[in-house]
Interface confidence: low
């Protein structure tokens, strides 16, 4: 689905667009950046207001308001392999069009560690409540969505758009509409502030076909910083109204002539600018000539004045603009220096945190250390990373490598590894036989028994029935039959379960001895999977039982 | 036109409950938010809560809070105001008024006011 | 709870004179660059009526001798020119934070 711009609201130097619809993170980044933008930034109290504002635009114009809790992308990310950073305010997520770690948050619940998938970060409204300013938006991390599944209740998005800078909307000294159109592809008959290279078409009148006038302004930087329409006294004045029309348009005073016509002034201390209705500051430092933080200092007697820099921060060439000082031009730091306004700061690759001697220095981070593992069984450190591995009759699996799970060697790849019945159980398995059958030394193997009508043998001794340890829910033992004994028929569908009686003899030959449980787990009937061939018993290669064990060492897991 | 009609006046014993209903024509009850202000004799106004017709939710003023019971019925476009262990104090005239959905939730429509007289 | 404070209490004025009435409220009711900040008038016998939102939006249908002005905490209410049917109560409402609070009321008579 595509996304409609419902609401703008400009304010400083940036613009915010709130569009709906079901959009994934991706689509809507991408939909801001055709225009110019980004993904909004919320980072402050400032911002989240200006955000807030678009918003409740936006849902004031929305005609039918199905979902009570609405979500809106902001341009809040973490990638995937990144892990969670509790110690910080945006807890590893970064904004997609760059720029520092900022103090501003407001989380809605605290975060999941996770680092399999790229998260994103949305804005959650509770349309339940009433929107009030002090009720800002908290923010929402979940999955990013994809084109086909946009992500759960996603309601839209909002998009910032970064200016030199604005001019003051246009005033009317009479009837008349003003349209401006923004670089952003938006058009708005009210915005409190106008972007740099905005158009504005005014159509002067009361709607009167035959005296509607119209006239077309382009939002110029007329000096370094200062932005205006170029245009020359108030708009679609008229003799009928006067000044009683909008104060004539003036920013100030209005002066009227007895033939109905006005003039702009200005209180003392200001002066009227070149179009002849804005006032400003005769102080030179009032126009606020000094750009990038610079502070503007009056010379003697009011008349010049200079800019001065914070620290971190240089004049640039104009002697008007503050630009930063690149202090990792000098190394200060072990691995990643990264530099912010005004200063810089060390940071660490993935897998070394800060710490150790000096300034700036990084350790290795300690993956495996008691009740950080993210492996459910083995877990070994590396520098800078580490991997997982599992125990014996167990493999690797999970999105991220770290989760073990059984492995059902009855149904193996190597081959059936009984020559009967298989037996699978936790991290192992056992062979059984047919009735009739008792399972040889070696315990693979079938040989002809006396004549019994007893069960199969294979169900685990009470020392057997042990778990690995790490192994989650237990499963039940399956038989398997493989290899029917020589000249046995093999088990057809319709053989009928064998049953196993309290009372019966059971052998089984466990291929690996493992910690018993401490409570005797419930034993239940094994299932019969039926064989594809069936041929006399045999040893398997090697005559040795461990073919049927298993070990995997593991990949490397994921930070 | 927009109207807001409220039920006729009530007279109640202390201790008892007194239920105000307020129907609306003349635009769509569920896309604005209804609100109650009360007004004792020769006092000001007191907001009292609010609740959205659309999905019956209530946010009440703290004062009121245990005592007083917003509902609605969409099929009739009608909300209600119950307050329950009723005082000398709570005689005042009660008004619905609707506001906007989102931002300056300023107070565009009002009933005529419903007059509630707490007399033993 | 945000407090809002009307003066004067009552207005005498001449017809065709201005009337000017001021609210101050405990803490600021500004928010990104709105005042939420409205007033009503309440004749007697009636519910109140809306006369400007937003500290300086006029209502439609409300006569231009009102206006409103103000931001942040001090806000004020100005009749340009009395006429007879102005003889009200007014009131400020902030709807800023809950609960929604409004002034005492200021009175407006004909001198």
């Known amino acids: 689905t595509g996304a409609d711009t419902e609401a703008v609201v400009c304010v400083g130097t940036a613009c915010y667009t709130a569009h709906s619809g079901k959009l994934s993170a991706a689509e809507a980044q991408n939909h801001c950046n055709q225009n110019g933008g980004n993904l909004a930034t919320v980072k402050s109290k400032e911002e989240a207001q200006h955000v807030q504002r678009v918003l409740a635009q936006l849902l004031r114009r929305e005609a039918a308001l199905t979902a009570r809790m609405s979500k809106f992308w902001i341009g809040l990310q973490r990638e995937k392999g990144k892990c969670l950073d509790p110690s910080l305010p945006l807890k590893g997520f970064s904004w997609v069009g760059g720029g520092e770690d900022t103090p501003y948050s407001n989380w809605h619940k605290e975060l999941r560690n996770s680092c399999i998938s790229k998260r994103c970060v949305s804005l959650l409204l509770d349309l339940s409540q009433p929107l009030l300013p002090s009720r800002l938006p908290k923010w929402s991390e979940g999955p990013c969505g994809s084109p086909g599944s946009p992500g759960s209740n996603i309601e839209g998005f909002v998009c910032k758009f970064s200016f030199k800078g604005m001019c003051r909307p246009l005033a009317l000294g009479g009837p008349g509409q003003v349209t401006y159109t923004t670089p952003f592809q938006t058009t708005s008959s009210s915005l409190e502030a106008v972007p740099f290279a905005s158009a504005a078409n005014v159509a002067c009148g009361e709607g009167d076909k035959d005296e509607t006038q119209s006239h077309y302004f382009l939002c110029k930087e007329k000096a370094p910083d200062v932005f205006d329409w170029g245009s020359s006294g108030p708009l679609c004045v008229s003799p009928k109204y006067g000044c009683n029309f909008n104060n004539g348009g003036c920013h100030q005073d209005c002066f009227e002539g007895g033939d109905g016509s006005f003039l702009c002034g200005c209180r003392p201390g200001f002066r009227l600018l070149d179009d002849l209705v804005t006032c400003a500051s005769r102080n030179p430092c009032s126009s606020s000539p000094c750009r990038g933080g610079a502070t503007c200092v009056l010379g003697p007697h009011g008349k010049n004045y200079t800019c001065r820099c914070p620290q971190g921060y240089q004049l640039d060439s104009s002697q008007l603009d503050c630009v930063d000082v690149d202090e990792c031009q000098d190394s200060p730091c072990a691995q990643e220096c990264v530099n912010t306004p005004g200063g810089f700061r060390c940071e660490c690759w993935v897998g070394y945190e800060p710490g150790g001697p000096g300034e700036g220095a990084c350790q290795d981070v300690d993956e495996c250390a008691l009740g950080r593992s993210p492996c459910a069984q083995g877990c070994t450190n590396t520098d800078g990373s580490f991997h997982c591995s599992c125990e014996e009759g167990y493999v690797l699996a999970g999105e991220d490598g770290t989760q073990c799970q059984d492995v059902d060697e009855c149904v193996g790849p190597g081959g059936p590894l009984c020559d009967s019945l298989c037996f699978n159980t936790q991290g192992s398995f056992h062979c059984g036989c047919l009735p009739g059958w008792v399972l040889a030394p070696n315990g693979v193997s079938c040989t002809m028994g006396p004549v019994s009508l007893g069960p199969p043998s294979g169900p685990p001794d009470e020392e057997d029935k042990g778990e690995k340890e790490g192994s989650t829910v237990p499963r039940a033992a399956t038989a398997s039959p493989t290899r029917g004994p020589e000249g046995t028929p093999k088990a057809t569908p319709t053989t009928s379960r064998p049953s196993l009686s309290s009372d019966a003899p059971i052998t089984s030959a466990p291929l690996k001895m493992l910690a018993p449980s401490g409570s005797p787990g419930v034993w239940r009937e094994p299932s019969i999977h039926h064989a594809t061939a069936a041929s006399g018993p045999q040893e398997p290669a090697g005559g040795d039982s461990s073919v049927a064990t298993q070990n995997n060492d593991g990949t490397d897991g994921q930070k | 036109q927009v109207q807001l009609v409220q039920s006729g006046a009530e007279v109640k014993k202390p201790g008892a409950s007194v239920k105000v209903s307020c129907k609306a024509s003349?635009?769509?009850?569920?896309?604005?938010?209804m609100h109650w202000v009360r007004q004792a004799p020769g006092q000001g106004l007191e907001w009292m809560g609010e609740?959205?017709?659309?999905?019956?939710?209530?946010y009440y003023n703290q004062k009121f809070k245990g005592r007083v019971t917003m509902t609605r019925d969409k099929s009739i476009s009608t909300a209600y105001m119950e307050l329950n262990s009723l005082t000398s104090d709570d005689s005042a005239v009660y008004y619905c008024?609707?506001?906007?959905?989102?931002?300056?939730?300023?107070?565009?429509?009002w009933g005529a006011g419903t007059t509630v007289t707490v007399s033993s | 709870d945000i407090v809002m404070t009307q003066s004067p209490d009552s207005l005498a004025v001449s017809l065709g004179e201005r009337a000017t009435i001021n609210c101050k409220a405990s803490q600021s009711v500004d928010y990104a660059g709105d005042s939420y900040l409205n007033w009503y008038q309440q004749k007697p016998g009636q519910p109140p009526k809306l006369l400007i939102y937003?500290?300086?939006n006029l209502e439609s249908g409300v006569p231009d001798r009102f206006s409103g002005s103000g931001s942040g905490t001090d806000f004020t209410l100005t009749i340009s020119s009395l006429q007879a049917e102005d003889v009200a109560v007014y009131y400020c409402q902030q709807t800023n934070e809950d609960p929604r609070t409004f002034g005492g009321g200021t009175k407006v008579e004909i001198k």
């Open positions: 008024a609707r506001s906007v959905y989102y931002g300056n939730k300023y107070f565009d429509v």
């Open positions: 937003a500290a300086s």
């Open positions: 003349g635009y769509t009850f569920t896309s604005y938010w």
């Open positions: 609740i959205d017709p659309s999905a019956s939710y209530t």
